[in-house]
């Protein structure tokens, strides 16, 4: 008669290596008597027998698991016990390795010049895979720009032009290679105008030929508006070579105007929008204010009434035919274009173009049409209207998004005299210090001035209608 | 990397006239007012002149109005003070810095860079 | 011009030590002040702007505060770099001017 003894297990397990799909087998040999009764765990969690992945053999010595999955890692160990002594245990690690295997690939992309553009590039297998990119033909190299990321995605920071075309990620490890498919990557650029109309001074009844270049990816679209309307004469000759589109007005000239040229283009759902201008002064035109560029006068229109202090003296543009008149119109276009923005963003806006358009005056031998102080029109720019100047921040286009406020004209910020130089030479806008408390702590001023505490919208250089161009930077 | 690096100091008799020059790199130069500021020997520091991004709009202290003239050149990347009438008071180190605005936008940022600065000494 | 005086003149102080530095200014500056740190041979550092807001990259042992015409500059644990002198100005209009500065040198 055969003695009783306690399990023994003489095949210890060891750690298994296998691909995924394939067979994987642990083995656990073991001597005792009576025969013992052998379970399995994963993880510590016991393994069924009826488990279809699982076959159990040779009296559950042998585990094997049928096609294995990467969810398959795990330690499994063979429980022995025949109530002689203590149950025995064993374990082995299963090291699920896999081929690379691209789980998120990238996928095509129009991305705008100066943007970041991400290409994913997710990646499964054991080892894990690394991750290269090819462009066209060539291995992708890493500079200060782009970067592969740890995800495997391809980062490009500030796009540019020649960042456009076809790119693949391929994820390699021992076990073997994947590559994704080929994915485009479309670069847009922001309509620029090359080339500006240039301002002309002109005899009564000549003709005219105003010339606008713009660039941009898509080709950019140009049209013109005469003192804030839409060009009502004139004949328009357009052409587009190489991305570059070339627009001339050709106008016969009755009265001096303000003209305006834009391009655009579209991204997606949004515009991109550019312009310059430039004036047409006919000759001898006004011979009381042949040596002026204007003159002080109190306001005496409706738009701006209650923005402007009362009473106050403003500047008046004779290179209009008929200033106040002309003013009050470009005033009245640039309001209906406000009415697309946002509530923080209008009444500063509002303040901006009034003070803008109506420039303080100092009457005097020469009338002085006095500037806004930089601050306040960077506080438009960057607090009260930071979204809606978002698209002025590319230095490469001049224009703004088709966010109601793409037509306006605004100063170039950065060409303005400081509040911290001479507080008394430049404007300040009442609604930014009256609202300032509610955004954020904002500069209050002294000054002799009597609205020293009062900011006043940026006011450029020179006046509205003799200035050829207008940007905000 | 920000730098500002000055030059055309030395040496120059009273009454006699020096060019000195900065040369600006590490950022967008039209950008930025720029100022002469100078420091006499074992002295404090004195605000000379500024002149904005565009040439636009300069100022003197009262001590140099009218004998010294800031310009600069934005398309070399360079600021310069022409000096003339020069009298032994104003011997000092002249710096060239910039000025700029925070992250918000408009809060200024006075004098954020410094030059080395150059000696200017003025003898018989 | 608007004048800006700071005191002391002189100030010894020892390492860890909490330092004070005031500046005045003639008249009302509201909070348009500066401070500087000036080691020998070397250019001015920008510290404070604003009255009291910090220079990126200046440590936050330095710290600015007043307004109008008070203002005082505070090192609240005093290091072996910090010594030198400290210069206040004001930039609130045309004429910007600078306090005589204050030297910081060891007890």
């Known amino acids: 008669e055969k003695l009783p003894k306690a399990p023994v297990i003489t095949t210890p397990l060891e750690t298994v290596d296998a691909l995924v799909e394939e067979v994987a087998t642990f083995m656990c040999a073991v001597e005792s008597y009576p025969q013992p009764e052998i379970s399995w765990t994963r993880n510590k969690i016991l393994i069924k027998l009826f488990d279809t992945r699982y076959s159990i053999r040779e009296n559950g010595q042998l585990l094997t698991i049928l096609s294995v999955e990467d969810s398959d890692d795990g330690i499994y160990c063979c429980i022995a016990n025949n109530g002689v002594g203590g149950a025995v245990e064993s374990c082995g690690a299963l090291q699920v390795k896999m081929k690379p295997k691209i789980t998120r690939p990238p996928i095509n992309v129009k991305i705008i010049e100066g943007l970041k553009a991400v290409l994913p590039c997710t990646t499964m297998g054991n080892p894990k895979p690394s991750v290269s990119w090819i462009k066209g033909d060539n291995a992708l190299r890493e500079n200060s720009r782009i970067a592969v990321l740890e995800s495997g995605s391809l980062r490009i920071h500030n796009v540019q032009k020649e960042d456009a075309g076809q790119y693949r990620c391929v994820a390699k490890n021992s076990l073997g290679t994947a590559y994704s498919k080929l994915v485009k990557l479309e670069v847009e650029v922001f309509a620029r105008i090359l080339r500006a109309p240039e301002s002309h001074n002109v005899t009564f009844g000549s003709f005219v030929t105003l010339r606008c270049t713009a660039i941009g990816i898509p080709v950019p679209t140009i049209s013109w508006i005469e003192n804030g309307n839409a060009v009502s004469s004139g004949s328009i000759q357009e052409s587009v070579k190489d991305r570059v589109i070339d627009s001339r007005l050709q106008l016969f000239i009755t009265k001096p105007g303000l003209y305006t040229c834009i391009a655009t283009n579209k991204h997606g759902e949004k515009f991109s929008t550019a312009k310059a201008a430039a004036t047409v002064s006919i000759a001898e035109w006004s011979k009381s204010q042949k040596d002026s560029q204007g003159y002080c006068a109190q306001y005496r229109g409706e738009v701006c009434d209650a923005v402007l202090a009362k009473d106050a003296l403003v500047f008046f543009n004779t290179s209009y035919r008929d200033p106040e008149d002309a003013q009050e119109l470009l005033i009245h276009t640039a309001w209906n274009e406000l009415k697309a923005v946002s509530p923080l963003c209008r009444p500063a806006a509002e303040a901006l173009l009034c003070n803008h358009l109506f420039q303080e005056c100092s009457p005097g031998v020469v009338p002085t049409p006095m500037p806004i102080c930089r601050e306040y029109c960077l506080a438009v720019k960057e607090l009260f209207c930071a979204k809606e100047w978002q698209a002025m921040e590319g230095k490469a286009h001049r224009g703004l998004y088709r966010s109601g406020m793409h037509l306006l004209p605004v100063p170039e910020c950065s060409k303005l005299p400081s509040m911290h130089r001479d507080p008394t030479a430049c404007t300040r806008l009442p609604y930014l210090d009256y609202k300032k408390e509610n955004i954020t702590t904002f500069p209050s001023i002294t000054s002799s001035r009597p609205s020293a505490d009062i900011p006043n919208l940026p006011a450029s250089t020179s006046s509205f209608a003799v200035s050829p161009a207008y940007s905000m930077t | 990397e920000v730098q500002l690096v000055e030059s055309g100091g030395g040496l120059v008799k009273p009454g006699g006239s020096l060019r000195l020059s900065c040369a600006a790199s590490g950022f967008t130069f039209s950008s930025y007012d720029m100022n002469w500021v100078r420091q006499a020997p074992g002295k404090g520091l004195e605000w000379v002149s500024s002149?904005?991004?565009?040439?636009?709009?300069?100022y003197y202290a009262d001590s140099v109005k009218g004998r010294f003239t800031i310009s600069r050149d934005n398309a070399k990347n360079s600021l310069y003070l022409q000096m003339n009438s020069l009298r032994a008071e104003d011997t000092a180190v002249y710096y060239c810095?910039?000025?700029?605005?925070?992250?918000?936008?408009?809060?200024?940022?006075?004098?954020?860079?410094w030059g080395q600065g150059t000696l200017v000494t003025v003898s018989s | 011009d608007i004048q800006m005086t700071q005191s002391p003149s002189t100030l010894s102080a020892s390492v860890g030590d909490r330092v004070t530095i005031t500046c005045r200014a003639s008249q009302s500056i509201d909070n348009w002040l500066a401070w500087y740190q000036q080691k020998p041979g070397k250019a001015p550092k920008l510290l404070i702007y604003k009255a009291s807001s910090l220079e990126s990259g200046v440590p936050s042992r330095f710290s600015g505060s007043g307004s109008g015409t008070e203002f005082i500059l505070t090192i609240s644990s005093l290091q072996p770099d910090d010594f030198a002198t400290y210069y206040c100005q004001q930039y609130n209009s045309h004429s910007w001017t600078f306090g005589q500065g204050t030297k910081v040198e060891i007890k």
């Open positions: 002149i904005s991004s565009s040439s636009s709009y300069i």
């Open positions: 810095a910039r000025d700029s605005y925070d992250s918000s936008g408009y809060y200024l940022r006075p004098f954020d860079y």
